[in-house]
């Protein structure tokens, strides 16, 4: 319905707590290195003016749009021009154009300080002291990190944090309440951001059918016994929910996806006998519990797809009223009939069959043509089958470092042109699906991996293409999103690449290597790892094995040595010695 | 300096096993990195396995992997081949070698060097 002030709206929908945070949020991840107190000044402004709307919908600039009245509170920052450079020149246009402007201008690998944990004591005399502010900051510190993350499901982290802290800062051992409770939150958060990246990747890069068509897939697996129409509804709703977060609308946003939730809660008996538990939740913890719903249980007596996609005479006639229906439809009841199978297989299955039906329609005797379509699906079904087979294979034989140890060295091999910070953190991520995936039966491995790796491997396409250095990164992230993983699976050593100049420098280390995380640590070796990689591309694995296990070995002598820095001074010169003259450097 | 001697070495039936063992002494054994390699008439010596110093690390030839386990024991200044499911390509003489590098010992460069021992599997 139009409403004559959309931001009173949005204000009475919302509820003041929710506008504020939501405000802050969408400012921080356009201004992503604006300071704190800048961002809580211009979201009290916003807000003020909001509660002025809601008294007077008829009062000056109330009618105006949400991204007038937020961009042009943006440009009112007087540091734009130094802070930002040419986003400033966003100023200068008119909307939709500026708001665009700012969209292109989000940085995924912005230049911000890592964020150190505090104290546990630190931290709770700061919640207790001002909780407002210290959960604002939160929310700041997040958004401004992860200009993508799913804003309504960020509410939803905010709240578990502040949780957390009323909770644990009044228990008797602080640490050892709140410390997991964080890690937890952090960890949970990296995924949410990554998983919502790929939906904005989608869609902006491959647009709102590419987008539909993975919700169809992965809703019709998720919800097998409810019908097509209401499966095409909740895909509709869905799509609108994202398309307005990834694009900056954030009150918007959150507000369909409460619509969305009740819609769901009211109409389970026709979705899924799943929803029931979250259905009864508050409204942030409903709209997680149903994103995280497990699958239905699929109906009993299924028919054979062939009936109706390759057997009936209708086929291309059905095909060519409504292609895309049809081809939704299809993909609705392989989904549903597949939840072993992941979502990218599926759609690669359709898009199989989309390209056989637009091939043999033309064709003379169509149905003789498509008639043996089903079994091109067999070797695209165990592609990734045996992919996922062996590496889990590789996982539970070496472990989690050392398999992504494998997984650097093969892919820095296949793109050495990347930077090493990306690579080692996607290959670090991309280990990850061992111990994520590989403990599920057979039936849930595939749709856990493929779809855990389409995530991953969107990571280094957003990295990638802030800086483009490789144009076999580009052509695997832009050609088709579905062949992604068996894009970059496919490529081998990159014959083309010219080693990189030996630096001894980056092999040298320090006796503060002793006082890190096992985590940083392990980071520090796979950077050193990655760099041999560079140097050496043909080396083989068990020369850099070699060479890595002399560098723990370095390691772990000069961190029990009396004087660690001589230690590491004069020890890692030999070493840096040995493996120049073992890998012919 | 360091003396490296072994022991273990004989005539075993396809498909038996050996234990070869590699006796340090001199400098302090848990320094080093040790590891075998092996000589068959008329061939290249070839990489067999290694052990870091603190046993925490090993690496074998692709040809040996799930059939031969090195090992050590530092408080015996002793180190030790596993031989199982011997097979005719076995034959050679088996050298024991320690160096401070693995990096180092791989490409057979290892400082120090033992006489060596004769496997012979015969079919």
């Known amino acids: 319905d139009a409403h004559k002030s959309e931001v009173a709206h949005r204000f009475k929908d919302l509820g003041e707590e929710n506008f504020k945070a939501l405000v802050l949020i969408a400012f921080a991840q356009y201004l992503q290195q604006c300071p704190f107190e800048d961002h809580v000044k211009l979201v009290n402004e916003v807000t003020e003016f909001a509660k002025t709307c809601v008294a007077d919908e008829s009062a000056e600039n109330c009618d105006k749009s949400l991204h007038t009245l937020f961009g042009d509170k943006l440009c009112t920052v007087a540091t734009l021009r130094e802070t930002y450079g040419e986003m400033a020149d966003c100023c200068a246009k008119q909307e939709p154009e500026r708001n665009e402007c700012f969209l292109q201008h989000k940085d995924d690998n912005p230049n911000l300080p890592r964020l150190v944990r505090p104290e546990v004591d630190v931290m709770c005399t700061a919640f207790h002291d001002n909780e407002e502010t210290f959960l604002k900051k939160y929310l700041y510190e997040i958004a401004r990190r992860h200009p993508y993350f799913y804003a309504p499901e960020l509410l939803f982290f905010a709240k578990r944090y502040k949780a957390a802290f009323t909770e644990c800062c009044q228990a008797a051992d602080k640490a050892a309440c709140l410390l997991p409770k964080l890690d937890e939150l952090r960890d949970e958060g990296k995924a949410s951001s990554a998983k919502q990246r790929l939906k904005c990747a989608s869609l902006q890069k491959f647009g709102e059918r590419a987008f539909k068509a993975w919700a169809v897939a992965r809703l019709s697996q998720r919800f097998p016994k409810a019908e097509f129409a209401e499966v095409s509804k909740l895909v509709t709703d869905l799509t609108k929910v994202h398309t307005e977060c990834c694009h900056g609308d954030l009150l918007e946003c959150a507000d369909d996806r409460a619509d969305l939730a009740k819609y769901i809660c009211e109409n389970q008996d026709s979705i899924s006998s799943k929803l029931k538990e979250c259905c009864e939740k508050p409204l942030l913890e409903k709209s997680h519990c149903i994103a995280e719903v497990e699958n239905d249980e699929m109906p009993a007596d299924l028919p054979s797809l062939a009936a109706d996609f390759v057997e009936s005479k209708d086929v291309c006639k059905n095909y060519a009223e409504a292609k895309d229906v049809f081809l939704g439809m299809f993909l609705y009841e392989y989904a549903r009939r597949h939840p072993d199978y992941s979502v990218v297989l599926l759609l690669r299955l359709a898009k199989t069959y989309e390209t056989t039906l637009e091939k043999c329609c033309a064709a003379a005797d169509p149905h003789e043509c498509y008639a043996k379509v089903f079994d091109e699906f067999k070797p695209l079904v165990e592609e990734p089958q045996n992919l996922i087979k062996q590496n889990c294979e590789l996982f539970e034989q070496l472990g989690e470092y050392k398999f992504q140890n494998a997984l650097l060295v093969r892919y820095t091999k296949k793109v050495p042109q990347v930077s090493t910070p990306t690579l080692v953190e996607v290959s670090r991520n991309l280990g990850k699906v061992g111990s994520k995936c590989c403990k599920h039966p057979e039936a849930k491995r595939m749709p856990c991996a493929e779809d855990y790796l389409s995530v991953v491997l969107n990571q280094l396409c957003v990295l990638h293409e802030k800086t483009p250095v490789s144009d076999r990164v580009t052509k695997c992230c832009t050609e088709s999103l579905v062949n992604r993983r068996p894009c970059f699976s496919a490529l081998e050593v990159d014959e083309t690449y010219v080693p990189k100049e030996f630096n001894a420098e980056t092999f040298t280390f320090h006796a503060d290597i002793c006082t890190l995380s096992e985590k940083e640590r392990q980071i520090k070796k796979q950077t050193a790892l990655v760099e041999l990689v560079k140097h050496k591309p043909k080396a083989t694995k068990e020369q850099l094995k070699a060479v890595m296990d002399d560098f723990a070995a370095f390691v772990e002598k000069c961190c029990k040595a009396d004087d660690k820095e001589t230690c590491f001074a004069e020890e890692g010169k030999k070493l840096v010695a040995a493996s120049q003259a073992a890998l012919g450097l | 300096q360091v003396q490296l001697v072994e022991s273990g070495g004989g005539l075993v039936q396809v498909g038996g096993s050996l234990r070869l063992s590699c006796a340090a002494s001199?400098?302090?054994?848990?320094?080093?990195?040790m590891g075998w390699f092996r000589q068959a008439p008329g061939k290249e010596r070839e990489f067999v396995a290694y052990i870091h110093w603190s046993g925490s690390s090993t690496s074998y030839a692709d040809s040996v992997k799930g059939r031969f386990t090195i090992s050590r024991d530092n408080t015996k200044n002793t180190m030790y081949l596993q031989m199982n499911s011997l097979k005719p390509e076995d034959t050679a003489v088996y050298y024991c070698t320690a160096d401070q590098y693995a990096s180092t010992l791989l490409r057979a460069a290892g400082e120090y060097w033992g006489q060596g021992t004769q496997v012979t599997v015969s079919s």
């Open positions: 001199g400098r302090t054994f848990s320094n080093y990195v």
